[in-house]
């Protein structure tokens, strides 16, 4: 530990990583050596940075000063930080940004200036010397109102650019066009007024575009003022966006301009509508282009129970391969929609309200003909037998996740789609496993249940996940002749022997930590002498603790030594 000049303490490790966040520092500590590589002073009370404060820290690679109250940084404060790669000045009181701060930072890869009360990004191009910059975050929620053409000059490639333009009033055309390539652009905008102007400048340079916190209720698409159809955008995310039936139709028109769009995502959005997506101008049906993946999470639809016929969406879905609709209060997927999803290979309906009887309507005859993976985790399924029977229509289904549904009981026999290879029944409160489990399985996850016995013959099973149950022994290897992976941690297993392990002829990975091991002399000698064991036991030695004898309880099996007298009683 090194004491700073103003009596608050910093802790530095031998690698030069210094942490001093959430203290009462009111200036940058002066008593540190020049070996310091990382300095985290976030959430303190530093208001002023002088030219000399950081002068000696020539090896500094990361400087985090977020949430301090900094209102002044002297011109040459960062002049000695030629090795600095990470600078976080977010959520301070910097109302004027100076290019002289950043000029010396030739190694800078990450710069965060979010949440400071500046109106613009300064008088001159701030970032033109930062040739190695890869992640840039700028803007604020209220005072940042103007984006200028020179703001991003000199930046050619960014992995991530986040702009909080929540209250943007003015956008100078081509301001964002100067950056040739941005992997991921996050744009916060409350209003959509300038959206199309900005969008025009992004189509040929941004790969993933994320729009946040925007009210699109009154959005209307008008033809883009660009001849370019050569769009680089592959993924478009709407996060915390408000939308209506009509404006969703307008958004779809906008998206149809993006020729290479593959993925659409809606997170935490609100749809104020009843599912009438026709569009008031009776436009042609929108071509969904190449979109293959649609992800919807936590969609809020106030008028969900007044939803109309979704048939206007059906033609848009035929080429989609992957759909996720998670935590959005879905209780029924219309049969007709399921039938239109001809190319769908992956469907995730986690954390919804599906019951078997309504799932039957969704998985009707000819529904989801290409479906291979179905995830129904944490829905309202209650009968394993009914669930399997309901899904018999899905001829190509190989992977099924029905974890976190409450089944309790497993019938003696069940019917399943015949190609089933993967079944997840974890956290379903089942007490026993029966012949209901399909023999075709290669992977079975039944972790976190109430099982005290596993005696199923699964001739093709390669991976068994059975942690967090009440098993007292390893399963019988002869019942699982192809097993490669066995994860059986956090059960009540007291011991296992070399003979038991050897009987799993194909086993490559065993995870058996967190059990109640009786550290007998036999168990200790077997585990401590087998060097090869460490290769198989992936969680060895940390998770293997003795439960008894009492005097070694809590100690690692690897470390315990019993006396000669204890072993020769």
């Amino acid at each position: 530990k090194e004491e700073s000049s103003n009596q608050a303490s910093l802790s530095c490790d031998h690698n030069g990583i210094c942490k001093g966040s959430s203290g009462s520092l009111n200036s940058i500590p002066s008593g540190l050596t020049e070996a310091v590589k990382s300095l985290d002073l976030s959430n303190n009370r530093i208001t002023y940075i002088s030219n000399s404060d950081l002068q000696r820290y020539v090896n500094l690679q990361a400087l985090v000063l977020t949430s301090n109250g900094i209102n002044t940084i002297e011109e040459d404060s960062f002049s000695s930080l030629g090795r600095l790669e990470h600078l976080d000045l977010s959520y301070n009181y910097l109302s004027n940004l100076s290019s002289s701060w950043f000029k010396p930072l030739s190694s800078l890869k990450f710069l965060n200036l979010l949440g400071n009360p500046y109106k613009t990004l300064g008088e001159t191009s701030l970032f033109s010397h930062l040739t190695k910059l890869r992640i840039l975050r700028v803007g604020n929620m209220d005072t940042f109102t103007k984006i200028q053409r020179k703001d991003f000059a000199g930046l050619t490639f960014l992995e991530e650019l986040e702009i909080d333009a929540s209250d943007l009033q003015s956008y100078e055309p081509k301001s964002l066009k100067s950056i040739q390539n941005v992997s991921h652009l996050i744009l916060h905008m409350k209003q959509h007024i300038l959206l199309l102007e900005i969008f025009v400048d992004l189509t040929s340079s941004v790969e993933c575009l994320e729009l946040r916190d925007t009210d699109l209720d009154t959005f209307h698409f008008s033809e883009l003022s660009t001849g370019e159809t050569n769009s680089l955008i592959k993924k478009f995310t709407f996060r915390n966006v408000k939308i209506t039936d009509e404006s969703l139709f307008q958004v779809m028109k906008l998206l149809s301009q993006i020729s290479g769009l593959l993925e659409l995502e809606f997170d935490d959005c609100t749809l104020n509508g009843v599912g009438d997506f026709r569009g008031s101008d009776n436009d042609r049906v929108i071509d969904p282009g190449k979109v293959e993946t649609v992800t919807i999470r936590r969609l809020h639809i106030p008028q969900f129970y007044s939803f109309n016929d979704l048939s206007t969406l059906y033609p848009l879905t035929e080429r989609v391969k992957r759909i996720t609709v998670e935590n959005s209060k879905v209780f029924l997927v219309p049969c007709l929609l399921s039938r239109h999803l001809k190319s769908l290979e992956y469907l995730d309906l986690s954390e919804n309200l599906m019951v078997e009887e309504y799932l039957k309507n969704s998985a009707c005859e000819d529904a989801w003909p290409s479906l291979q993976t179905l995830i129904l985790r944490q829905n309202h399924l209650a009968s394993l037998g009914k669930t399997g029977e309901t899904l018999l229509t899905l001829k190509n289904l190989t992977n099924l996740d029905i974890s976190k549904n409450t089944f309790h009981y497993m019938p003696e026999t069940c019917q399943w789609p015949e190609k089933m290879k993967y079944l997840n029944l974890s956290s379903t409160r089942i007490h026993s496993v029966t012949g209901c489990i399909p023999k075709t399985l290669e992977i079975l996850d039944i972790s976190n249940n109430n099982l005290n016995l596993f005696s199923l013959n699964l001739p093709q099973l390669k991976e068994l996940y059975i942690s967090r149950n009440k098993l007292m022994t390893l399963p019988d290897a002869s019942l699982l002749p192809m097993l490669l992976v066995l994860k059986i941690s956090r059960n009540t297993i007291t011991t296992f022997s070399k003979e038991q392990l050897d009987s799993f002829h194909t086993l490559k990975t065993l995870e058996a930590g967190g059990n109640n091991f009786i550290c007998s002399c036999e168990f200790l000698s077997f585990t401590q002498e087998q060097q090869a064991l460490a290769k198989v036991l992936v969680d060895w030695p940390a998770n293997y603790l003795c439960d008894s004898p009492s005097h070694v309880r809590g100690q690692r099996v690897q470390d315990v030594r019993l006396s000669v007298s204890e072993c020769h009683r």
Partner: antibody
């Protein structure tokens, strides 16, 4: 097994407020909606509204929008309904019920009798 | 609001015979091929108990003598053969549109 245990009978003065509770057990509280239903003396059933414990979202019958407030405490798996500005019209048995499949009420509490009288 | 009209308000039946209770909705309660209509039984001093959901799906643990049918606006609950334990109140309920509404109830009586 699934259970919804409601708080005991209440006798309150007109104009006052009352908070009824519904403690859930035997299922994952945050996975299901909790509905509230009113049954006046010798009368039919009237849907008040629901709350989803996972995100706290609510939906109300317009007739009860200014009368009832729904909340949950996920740490104790308990749902609450507070009724305001009580009148004799509010005297009734109030049931909480678990909403399954987004559409049906498969488990009900035993009911709380509310009597509003001076 | 969708109004549910149950008929008759009371029905006298002989034990062992069939009882049919009707419920008519003021507009369709169809939702993409599923009728969002439920039936509940209520005994005196007890909460309602779910019998049928989605118009025809019998809730787990409910005796097979109970069945539901219908679509669109017209639904019925059938009990056959009627047992003494069934001589109580029955309510229909729709969850197609908010606010969810219940029928006025039908009281089963012994003839």
């Amino acid at each position: 097994q699934v259970q919804l245990q409601q708080s005991g009978p209440e006798l309150v003065n007109p104009g006052a407020s009352v908070k009824l509770s519904c403690k859930a057990s035997g299922f994952t509280f945050t996975t299901y909606g909790i509905n509230w239903v009113k049954q006046g003396p010798g009368q039919g059933l009237e849907w008040i509204g629901w709350i989803y414990p996972r995100d706290g979202s609510t939906n109300f019958n317009e007739n009860f929008k200014d009368k009832a407030a729904l909340t949950v405490d996920t740490s104790s798996s308990t749902a609450y309904m507070e009724l305001h500005s009580l009148t004799s019209e509010d005297s009734a048995v109030y049931f909480c019920a678990r909403l399954t499949g987004g559409t049906f009420l498969d488990y009900w509490g035993q009911g709380t009798t509310l009597t509003v009288s001076s | 609001d969708i109004v549910l009209t149950q008929s008759p308000a009371s029905l006298a039946v002989s034990l062992g015979q069939r009882a049919t209770i009707s419920c008519r909705a003021s507009e369709s309660v169809e939702y993409y091929g599923t009728s969002l209509m439920q039936w509940y039984q209520q005994k005196p001093g007890q909460p309602p108990k779910l019998l049928i959901f989605g118009a025809s799906n019998v809730e787990s643990g409910v005796p097979v003598r109970f069945s539901g049918s219908g679509s669109g606006t017209d639904f019925s609950l059938n009990i056959h053969p009627v047992e003494e334990d069934d001589i109580v109140m029955y309510f229909c309920q729709q969850s197609r549109k908010l606010p969810w509404t219940f029928g006025g109830g039908t009281k089963l009586e012994i003839k």
